[in-house]
């Protein structure tokens, strides 16, 4: 099985023990590590952070001691914006220039492939996204002709039904991608006005339309029905939680909220907590399991957080094995307890290790 793990370059900027550099990563933990994100400037793939090149080197030296490890560079992301991707993909010349710039850039910096993180193609971009993938793959095949190992091509796709329908021609893009990471998280957010888990495995008993689509099981099944081969589908598992501020004394699933949860000490983003911050939060919190959805949430005071723990990730791995998927994807290594100092287990990357162990279990 594949264990595809994202590393985010901006994690270097977190304060104190939250700061994560690629040299903190475990070279034997994942089969693939994806560095997020690269930029595109003047239609050429480019660095984003000022020190990206140094971090690329730091990441890729992990392969010195584990030659089986593959590293990919993810281009795009939330800050890049869909419009910029749209401009490049829809213009034949821009698209060609971008595609041509990728192999030398990846080779120069020691990457084994490219991950496309166009978040997200609009309805009018659907065909352009397919063309971009098809032409990128063709370029990778051509570039590898002189006996080089062919560069890998993957894409991170939304797990939301509405986005899947408008953005992707699943059957066509699947032909050209080496694997597809489906982002089976962020199904529920503060915009809903109530508490809810952002990455449930199954549909909740109370879920009505459109909530019945907002779960991992539906998204995976839908992708498979649309023609994604199970052998190429990698299922996303988050090492972060989504938090809310409760608006009343109600604390269950569906309780009213006044907004996102308070920012974490290190990640500093309202409504989001890294797993290592959740481990801190759990001290003195009340933990519940949403039985049907097979995921936990915790409450403390007026704070509510839905997250994944070692038990829930094992359930998710068992599920992906039952569906004969290609493996699991983790967003992100730097949100797991990468130092092993927060979650009281004397173990670095406890969630990712639990996923790895479950994938290896017979």
């Amino acid at each position: 099985y594949k264990l595809v793990c994202y590393y985010t370059s901006w994690s270097q900027y977190r304060e104190g023990d939250g700061s994560c550099f690629p040299d903190a990563l475990d070279r034997f933990l994942c089969t693939h590590i994806i560095y997020s994100f690269a930029n595109i400037s003047n239609d050429h793939i480019d660095t984003w952070e000022w020190n990206d090149v140094t971090l690329y080197g730091m990441l890729n030296t992990l392969k010195n001691r584990n030659p089986n490890l593959k590293t990919l560079l993810s281009v795009g992301g939330w800050n890049f914006g869909s419009q910029r991707f749209s401009k490049i993909a829809s213009n034949t010349q821009s698209r060609r220039t971008f595609i041509k710039s990728v192999p030398p850039f990846l080779r120069t910096h020691g990457f084994d492939g490219l991950d496309l993180a166009w978040l997200y193609p609009g309805r009018r971009d659907k065909q352009h996204f397919t063309t971009l993938i098809k032409e990128m793959k063709a370029e990778f095949i051509k570039e590898a002709q002189p006996g080089k190992k062919q560069l890998l091509l993957s894409a991170a796709l939304s797990a939301g039904k509405v986005t899947i329908d408008s953005s992707y021609d699943i059957a066509k893009i699947s032909q050209h991608l080496d694997f597809i990471s489906i982002m089976t998280y962020d199904f529920h957010g503060a915009w809903r006005g109530t508490t809810g888990h952002h990455s449930p495995l199954f549909r909740g008993q109370e879920d009505a339309s459109p909530d019945r689509f907002s779960n991992t099981d539906y998204a995976v099944g839908y992708m498979l029905r649309l023609g994604a081969p199970a052998s190429k589908l990698v299922m996303g598992i988050p090492t972060f939680g989504r938090s809310f501020t409760l608006a009343s004394s109600e604390t269950g699933v569906g309780a009213p909220i006044s907004g996102p949860g308070i920012p974490g000490r290190f990640t500093k983003e309202a409504g989001t907590l890294a797993y290592y911050e959740i481990c801190d939060f759990l001290r003195g919190a009340t933990v519940h399991r949403i039985l049907g959805q097979q995921v936990p949430y915790a409450t403390k005071g007026n704070q509510w957080v839905g997250y994944d723990d070692q038990e829930s990730v094992k359930s998710k791995v068992q599920y992906l094995k039952d569906r004969q998927l290609a493996g699991a994807m983790v967003w992100a290594l730097d949100l797991d307890d990468f130092q092993g100092s927060f979650c009281g287990q004397d173990l670095r990357f406890p969630l990712t290790n639990a996923i790895k162990d479950a994938l290896a279990a017979t």
Epitope: Y13, W50, T54
Partner: antibody, heavy 116, light 107 residues
């Protein structure tokens, strides 16, 4: 061996111009952001300017904004600093530095003296 | 702009002493604090980046700590070659700024 070598310094009158160069070798110059840092005689270090690897992003200290221009020629592995409208307070040793996780490689510096 | 204030501006110490230099930022700079050593007539040399990470080839007697606005460079046992001027620098946001320097002299 990774190396940066500055040149172009010298004596110039107030209001005059000078162009500094920094020749890079031993690393893939086009992949790294570069900086200029200066040090007035007997004083501390002052960051002057920065340019991204592609040249698409440029930053200046307020003290030189509008007078100095940073540029690079990746085909020649060279960084430049065009200094116009020079003032006495611009007198300093000018260093170029490579951006790694911070300024991990520095040149030996070139002295610029602004005096009448 | 972010101001960096180093203290002391100079200190006298003997070989074998433990030396501590502090650097304070005018606003939070997360972990984005670097330390450089400079000897007379020479270019600065990177010692520590990102608050506590030792640059390759730098002796382990040098260490850094801190977070947010307050940072420390420690030399656990001062050696003859350590007599120099030390600068902190923030690379959290432009314009990058340096502290005014701390000169470590022989007592």
């Amino acid at each position: 061996e990774v190396q940066l070598v500055e040149s172009g310094g010298g004596l110039v009158q107030p209001g005059g111009s000078l162009r500094l160069s920094c020749a890079a070798s031993g690393f893939t110059f086009s992949s790294y952001a570069m900086h200029w840092v200066r040090q007035a005689p007997g004083k501390g270090l002052e960051w002057v300017s920065a340019i991204s690897s592609s040249g698409g992003s440029i930053y200046y200290a307020d003290s030189v904004k509008g007078r100095f221009t940073i540029s690079r020629d990746n085909s020649k592995n060279t960084l430049y600093l065009q200094m116009n409208s020079l003032r006495a307070e611009d007198t300093a040793v000018y260093y170029c530095a490579k951006q790694g996780l911070s300024f991990d490689i520095w040149g030996q510096g070139t002295l610029v003296t602004v005096s009448s | 702009d972010i101001q960096m204030t180093q203290s002391p501006s100079s200190l006298s110490a003997s070989v074998g002493d433990r030396v501590t230099i502090t650097c304070r930022a005018s606003q939070s700079i997360s972990n984005w604090l670097n330390w450089y050593q400079q000897k007379p007539g020479k270019a600065p040399k990177l010692l520590i980046y990102a608050t506590s990470r030792l640059q390759s080839g730098v002796p382990s007697r040098f260490s850094g700590s801190g977070s947010g606005t307050d940072f420390t460079l420690t030399i656990s046992s001062l050696q003859p070659e350590d007599f120099a001027t030390y600068y902190c620098q923030q690379s959290y946001s432009f314009p990058y700024t340096f502290g005014q320097g701390t000169k470590v002299e022989i007592k």
